[in-house]
Amino acid sequence: LTCLGGFASPGPVPPSTALRELIEELVNITQNQKAPLCNGSMVWSINLTAGMYCAALESLINVSGCSAIEKTQRMLSGFCPHKVSAGQFSSLHVRDTKIEVAQFVKDLLLHLKKLFREGQFN
């Protein structure tokens, strides 16, 4: 993840295998969604900035009993240097805004895609 600062370089740099797998899991969730994801559970919105992986995990970890996002939760924990438990709060949360998990996942995916296109698409 520390490589993300380097995306303004002339040519693109593909993601690490772990980040590639996270993106693919988010794609799977968004494309294979039939019923409302996690029964329409709501989570805190986050600012998609430098510490977004921990913030995303802090938000999603409050959703329990939803097998569809368990893999995403595990993957995000691999990108977050500290242990995250339910009820934790980060300054990156937009504390007055809750959104559906499906929208949260879609926003995270779109942001990751933007990150990787930066410096390549003018």
Partner: antibody
Framework: QVQLVQSGAEVKKPGASVKVSCKAS????????IHWVRQAPGQGLEWMGA????????AYNQKFKGRVTMTTDTSTSTAYMELRSLRSDDTAVYYC????????????WGQGTLVTVSS | EIVLTQSPATLSLSPGERATLSCRAS??????LHWYQQKPGQAPRLLIY???QSISGIPARFSGSGSGTDFTLTINSLEPEDFAVYYC?????????LGGGTKVEIK
């Protein structure tokens, strides 16, 4: 099912321009980049460039910079590739293809558009 | 620019034989390499992605291997419909580049 349907064959004179269209269906258009690849008769495949339909951002192969313009119309889920100042060696089949992110594979392709440049 | 060199240019084999196609990159591209099949008059078709990942709907006789600079596409027990041109593609960095192709023809 995912489909990329391209416009029909074109015959152009040297110096002219051509604009090839690629209409996408069966998926959310802005979720995937559109890349253009060409193939001269009996030759291999050559990447021309790409466009991100969500932002309109483009990435072109240096070889075609200044001569090629890629655009999209999100309202009709259509991508366009315009090539200017055509030469005889631009005679080729032009393909559009979609990629989720540039490092992904080209998983769906258009049927191809033959552009013939001849005086 | 990453140059992909495919060899051999032509492979003459009989149905039932094994085909081994090589693709060499001019620099390390990890596993960001994809393989396509193209038949005359048709658009290319994706066979293998990320060097070794199979695609649903593609017969199991197609497999890929390799990482870094050296990659291989193997077709176990060639079927008549496998005679075609095969291309490798660099997905590591712009400009995206493709190898010159290997034509697998009937001996």
């Amino acid at each position: 099912q995912v489909q990329l349907v391209q416009s029909g064959a074109e015959v152009k004179k040297p110096g002219a321009s051509v604009k090839v269209s690629c209409k996408a269906s069966g998926y959310t258009f802005i979720d995937y980049e559109i890349h253009w690849v060409r193939q001269a008769p009996g030759q291999g495949l050559e990447w021309m460039g790409a466009i991100d339909p969500e932002t309109g951002g483009t990435a072109y192969n240096q070889k075609f910079k200044g001569r090629v313009t890629m655009t999209t119309d999100t309202s009709t889920s259509t991508a366009y590739m315009e090539l200017r100042s055509l030469r005889s060696d631009d005679t080729a089949v032009y393909y559009c293809t979609r990629i989720l992110l540039y490092y992904y594979p080209m998983d769906y392709w258009g049927q191809g558009t033959l552009v013939t440049v001849s005086s | 620019e990453i140059v992909l060199t495919q060899s051999p240019a032509t492979l003459s084999l009989s149905p039932g034989e094994r085909a081994t196609l090589s693709c060499r990159a001019s620099q390390n591209i990890s596993d960001y390499l994809h393989w396509y099949q193209q038949k005359p008059g048709q658009a290319p078709r994706l066979l293998i992605y990320y060097a070794s990942q199979s695609i649903s709907g593609i017969p199991a006789r197609f497999s890929g291997s390799g990482s870094g600079t050296d990659f291989t596409l193997t077709i176990n027990s060639l079927e008549p419909e496998d005679f075609a041109v095969y291309y490798c593609q660099n997905g590591h960095s712009f400009p995206l580049t493709l190898g010159g192709g290997t034509k697998v023809e009937i001996k």
